[in-house]
C-alpha cells in the first residue's frame, strides 16, 4: 500500500513539475527590468527565452520574437536546449510511468516490469529536474553577471547635461517558477525510485525439505526460487512523441488600430 | 466615435475643494488607462494623474500628490478628479485624455475651467 | 523629471514652405526592450484641446496628412512639415512618453508671415 502511494505521489509531484517546466519555458519574464531607479516608468521591458517583450503604461504590449539563430548568445541557447531537454526526458518518463503505476493493469505485466518501468521514469524524473533547474541557474547567473556590468557603467554619458540610462534586467518570474518545478521533478523523480524497491520482490530462498516416503527413501528438494528484479535487459521499445514547438511572431495585446511593425 | 466630456468646473475660494468628471463614450472605456492634463499660459500643458485600466496603478504629478485623487467608474464610464487644498496655481483648464500607443494621448476632452482665488 | 526643450518658441512661416522644429530631452527616450523612441508630437490650435500627430518619434497617428513627419534619436527630435497649410498654424508639444512623471515641453509657436 505504501508502495503504490509512494509512487503515486511521485507521478503527481513529477507531473506538476514538467507542467511548471513546460510553463516556465513558455514565460516570457525570464527577466525583467530592475525598477530600482524608476519605479514609475511608463515603459517596462521584460524577457524570455523565445521572445523580448516591452509593456507600456498605456496598456499595450509589443512581443517580437528572436528571428536570428545564430546572432543569440550561446548561453541563451544552452539554457533553451537544457529546458528542451528537460521537457522531452520529464515528458517520456511521464509516458513510462502511467504504465508502470501500481494501480494500473495492463495485460499480464508482471511487477519486475513494473519496478523495471518505474526506476526509468524516476531516473528520467531526476534527470528532467536536473535539466530545469541548471538551465535556470545558467541564465540566472548571466543576468546577476550582466546586472553588475550595466550597473558599473550606469549612466554612459556623464559628459553634459544628457543622460542615457542604460536598462537593468533582473530575476523574472519565469525563474522560480523554472526553480519550483525543476525540484518537484527531482523530488518526484526520487520518490519514484524509492517505489520501485518496494515493487522489486524480494529474492526469496526456500530451504531443502526431505520428505521420508515409506518404503523408499526420496528426497525431494524444490531448487531456490529467484526473482527477477528486472534491472536486467528488460527493455521495451517505447515510442517518443514530440509535439512540434509553435512561437507567436509579434502579440499586440490592445484593441488593434494599426499595422506599425 | 470616441468623445470626452469634462464637467464640474468653476470658481473655488483657496483651501476649497471640487470634484471634477469626464464622461466617456465611443469605447470600452474600462479598456483604457486614464489621464488628467491641466493647461496654464504660463506653465503650459502639465500632466496631473493617471489611472489604470484596473484602476491601479495610479500616478500622481509631484504638485498634486496628497491633494488630488484620480478615481474611475468603469461601468458608469466616467473618470474623476477629487481636488482638495486648492491653491491659485491649480487655477487652469482641466482635460481627461485617454492613453494610447506610444504612451500617447490620442483622444482628449474639450477641458474643463477651474479658477482657485478669493 | 525628464526635462523637455523646444526650440523657436516662434516660427513665421509663409504658406508652402517647408518648417522644421527641434525637441530635446535631458535624457534618452530611446528605449532598448523594442528600439523605439518614446517622444509625442501635437498640435494645439486657439480654443481647441491638444490634437496627437506623432507617437514613437516618427509613427504619424491615423489621419494625420503626411506632410507631417517625425524624426530624431535618443535626446534630439524634430517635427517637420514638408508644405505648411494655412490650417496648420498652431502650436506644437512635444511630450515626454517614456517615464513618470510624463512632461510636455513649452510649444513652438507657427505664425503666418
Known amino acids: 500500500m505504501a508502495v503504490t502511494a509512494c509512487q503515486g505521489l511521485g507521478f503527481v509531484v513529477s507531473l506538476i513539475g514538467i507542467a511548471g517546466i513546460i510553463a516556465a519555458t513558455c514565460m516570457d519574464q525570464w527577466s525583467t527590468q530592475d525598477l530600482y531607479n524608476n519605479p514609475v516608468t511608463a515603459v517596462f521591458n521584460y524577457q524570455g527565452l523565445w521572445r523580448s517583450c516591452v509593456r507600456e503604461s498605456s496598456g499595450f504590449t509589443e512581443c517580437r520574437g528572436y528571428f536570428t539563430l545564430l546572432g543569440l548568445p550561446a548561453m541563451l541557447q544552452a539554457v533553451r536546449a537544457l529546458m528542451i531537454v528537460g521537457i522531452v526526458l520529464g515528458a517520456i518518463g511521464l509516458l513510462v510511468s502511467i504504465f508502470a503505476l501500481k494501480c494500473i493493469r495492463i495485460g499480464s505485466m508482471e511487477d519486475s516490469a513494473k519496478a523495471n518501468m518505474t526506476l526509468t521514469s524516476g531516473i528520467m524524473f531526476i534527470v528532467s529536474g536536473l535539466c530545469a533547474i541548471a538551465g535556470v541557474s545558467v541564465f540566472a547567473n548571466m543576468l546577476v553577471t550582466n546586472f553588475w556590468m550595466s550597473t558599473a557603467n550606469m549612466y554612459t554619458g556623464m559628459g553634459g547635461m544628457v543622460q542615457t540610462v542604460q536598462t537593468r534586467y533582473t530575476f523574472g518570474a519565469a525563474l522560480f517558477v523554472g526553480w519550483v518545478a525543476g525540484g518537484l521533478t527531482l523530488i518526484g523523480g526520487v520518490m519514484m525510485c524509492i517505489a520501485c524497491r518496494g515493487l522489486a520482490p524480494e529474492e526469496t530462498n526456500y530451504k531443502a525439505v526431505s520428505y521420508h516416503a515409506s518404503g523408499h527413501s526420496v528426497a525431494y528438494k524444490p531448487g531456490g526460487f529467484k526473482a527477477s528484479t528486472g534491472f536486467g535487459s528488460n527493455t521495451k521499445n517505447k515510442k517518443i512523441y514530440d509535439g512540434g514547438a509553435r512561437t507567436e511572431d509579434e502579440v499586440q495585446s490592445y484593441p488593434s488600430k494599426h499595422d506599425y511593425v | 466615435d470616441v468623445q470626452l466630456v469634462e464637467s464640474g468646473g468653476g470658481l473655488v475660494q483657496p483651501g476649497g475643494s471640487r470634484k471634477l468628471s469626464c464622461a466617456a463614450s465611443?469605447?470600452?472605456?474600462?479598456?483604457?488607462?486614464m489621464h488628467w492634463i491641466r493647461q496654464t499660459p504660463e506653465k503650459g500643458l502639465e500632466w496631473v494623474a493617471y489611472?489604470?485600466?484596473?484602476?491601479?496603478?495610479?500616478y500622481y504629478a509631484d504638485t498634486v500628490k496628497g491633494r488630488f485623487t484620480i478615481s474611475r467608474d468603469n461601468p458608469k464610464n466616467t473618470l474623476f478628479l477629487q481636488m482638495t487644498s486648492l491653491r491659485s496655481e491649480d487655477t487652469a483648464m482641466y482635460f481627461c485624455?485617454?492613453?494610447?500607443?506610444?504612451?500617447?494621448?490620442?483622444?482628449w476632452g474639450q477641458g474643463t475651467l477651474v479658477t482657485v482665488s478669493a | 523629471d525628464i526635462v523637455m526643450t523646444q526650440s523657436p518658441s516662434f516660427l513665421t512661416v509663409t504658406a508652402g514652405e517647408k518648417v522644421t522644429m527641434s525637441c530635446r530631452s535631458s535624457?534618452?527616450?530611446?528605449?532598448?526592450?523594442?528600439?523605439?523612441?518614446?517622444l509625442t508630437w501635437y498640435q494645439q490650435k486657439p480654443g481647441q484641446p491638444p490634437k496627437l500627430l506623432i507617437y514613437w518619434a516618427s509613427t504619424r497617428e491615423s489621419g494625420v496628412p503626411d506632410r507631417f513627419t517625425g524624426s530624431g534619436s535618443g535626446t534630439d527630435f524634430a517635427l517637420t512639415i514638408s508644405s505648411v497649410q494655412a490650417e496648420d498654424l498652431a502650436l506644437y508639444y512635444c511630450q515626454n512618453a517614456y517615464s513618470f512623471p510624463l512632461t510636455f515641453g513649452a510649444g513652438t509657436k507657427l505664425e503666418l508671415k
Open positions: 465611443g469605447f470600452t472605456f474600462s479598456g483604457f488607462g
Open positions: 535624457q534618452s527616450l530611446l528605449n532598448s526592450g523594442n528600439q523605439r523612441n518614446y
Open positions: 489611472i489604470s485600466s484596473g484602476s491601479r496603478p495610479i
Open positions: 485624455a485617454r492613453f494610447y500607443y506610444g504612451n500617447s494621448f490620442d483622444h
